[in-house]
Interface confidence: low
Amino acid sequence: EVEKTACPSGKKAPEIDESLIFYKKWELEACVDAALLATQMDRVNAIPFTYEQLDVLKHKLDELYPQGYPESVIQHLGYLFLKMSPEDIRKWNVTSLETLKALLEVNKGHEMSPQVATLIDRFVKGRGQLDKDTLDTLTAFYPGYLCSLSPEELSSVPPSSIWAVRPQDLDTCDPRQLDVLYPKARLAFQNMNGSEYFVKIQSFLGGAPTEDLKALSQQNVSMDLATFMKLRTDAVLPLTVAEVQKLLGPHVEGLKAEERHRPVRDWILRQRQDDLDTLGLGLQG
């Protein structure tokens, strides 16, 4: 903690400006009014304070707002956000998407820090659900965000938010997560026509049950091998040779290259050799 000392004569800061970078830590503590700092937080970012000086400014705000900063201050924290601890952030009530964007911008290009994770958690809990605009924002900054959530957390995602999800946002999701997301996606895209529906649902199919894959096989969708390889093994196993052939369209010819990998390997072992032979791919059950 910085020791309390009187501000030298003529040093009292009338506003937050560049002259403050020449202040020693104790002078900043003594000569900058916390309320003034709170109202002029937007200026702090434009001034090249040292990390030690930022520590002092944070301390002043902590004293002014022991129960947590108001959103008007949080929105303009800028680089001072990097000085916050998860414990500090847990005291905040962030409701504005603009505030969230401003703070995520500060951390842009870096991996998700504990501070950012806490901020997002507070924000989403404050909203009650992961709505489309929030998801749009979070996946723009952190493409892997969705897959970092637990299946329980994903259950709070409303189907309407699924429209914000891009294929790359699901790259690192495991089957348990896709099990939760797939039914939501199915609901979200239910009014689309066949080919458009398939384009949208494709990334989520790792959570699809057998009956949905059977239905897709009747719709001339031409699923590529990369998508097929991500399907649940238990969902693929009951499919007949004819259904897989219809499901993959021209890509059925690529099964040969994947015959030693799951789920293709396990599916092949479940089929009658006579049926496999009809594919003309030399697959051995």
């Epitope: 384009v199 031409s222 590529d224 003309g280």
Partner: antibody
Framework: QVQLQQPGTELVKPGASVKLSCKAS????????MHWVKQRPGQGLEWIGN????????NYNEKIKNKATLTVDKSSSTAYMQLSSLTSEDSAVYYC?????????????WGQGTTLTVSS | DIVMTQSQKFMSTTVGDRVSITCKAS??????VAWYQQKPGQSPKLLIY???NRYTGVPDRFTGSGSGTDFTLTISNMQSEDLADYFC?????????FGAGTKLELK
């Protein structure tokens, strides 16, 4: 080595039918699907359809579905395409091409093409 | 049907040039795109498959790139034997479709 042999030319009258052949050698005929492609003089390539030589299963381009019929004779390792109700629009070079799913390549071997001329 | 558009029907080039031929798909085809070379009186020859993989025996001056809807075939050091028609093809879904072709000519 892999070869797909096609007759050089066919001359037929409008309204007639013709059966083009494609004899495969140098590989296991039933292990690779055979596709047929049309090319009109100075034009691009148009996919007609494909056939699975193992069981005769086919896929056709819907635009020209009623024009072509694909068949195979496994005993002679030959693929056939019958074209019916011929008009001058059907005058073109017709290629057979093998699809190699083992390496997930598309058409790795093509026949030399049969030039079909429809004229009275 | 997926339309493959090769906007340049002809391209003039000289030996040693770097030539880029483009192809645009009307919808997302991932990387299921091949490039073929065709010389007069001959059948097409496979150059590139899966958008960027060079087929066996194809000189390394030929490279493919792109995914989704935009694809490019690049010849880094144009040779006289490369004068030919070049076609792109999608094999993402039936019916398989080809571009109209780009003819490389000498300036």
């Amino acid at each position: 080595q892999v070869q797909l042999q096609q007759p050089g030319t066919e001359l037929v009258k409008p309204g007639a039918s013709v059966k083009l052949s494609c004899k495969a050698s140098g590989y296991t005929f039933t292990s690779y699907w055979m596709h047929w492609v049309k090319q009109r003089p100075g034009q691009g390539l148009e996919w007609i359809g494909n056939i699975n030589p193992s069981n005769g299963g086919t896929n056709y381009n819907e635009k020209i579905k009623n024009k072509a019929t694909l068949t195979v004779d496994k005993s002679s390792s030959t693929a056939y395409m019958q074209l019916s109700s011929l008009t001058s629009e059907d005058s073109a070079v017709y290629y057979c091409a093998r699809w190699n799913y083992y390496g997930n390549y598309p058409f790795d071997y093509w026949g030399q093409g049969t030039t079909l001329t429809v004229s009275s | 049907d997926i339309v493959m558009t090769q906007s340049q029907k002809f391209m003039s080039t000289t030996v040693g040039d770097r030539v880029s031929i483009t192809c645009k798909a009307s919808q997302n085809v991932g990387t299921a795109v091949a490039w073929y070379q065709q010389k007069p009186g001959q059948s097409p020859k496979l150059l590139i498959y899966s958008a960027s993989n060079r087929y066996t025996g194809v000189p390394d001056r030929f490279t493919g790139s792109g995914s989704g809807t935009d694809f490019t075939l690049t010849i880094s050091n144009m040779q006289s034997e490369d004068l030919a028609d070049y076609f792109c093809q999608q094999y993402s879904s039936y019916p398989l479709t080809f571009g109209a072709g780009t003819k490389l000519e000498l300036k």
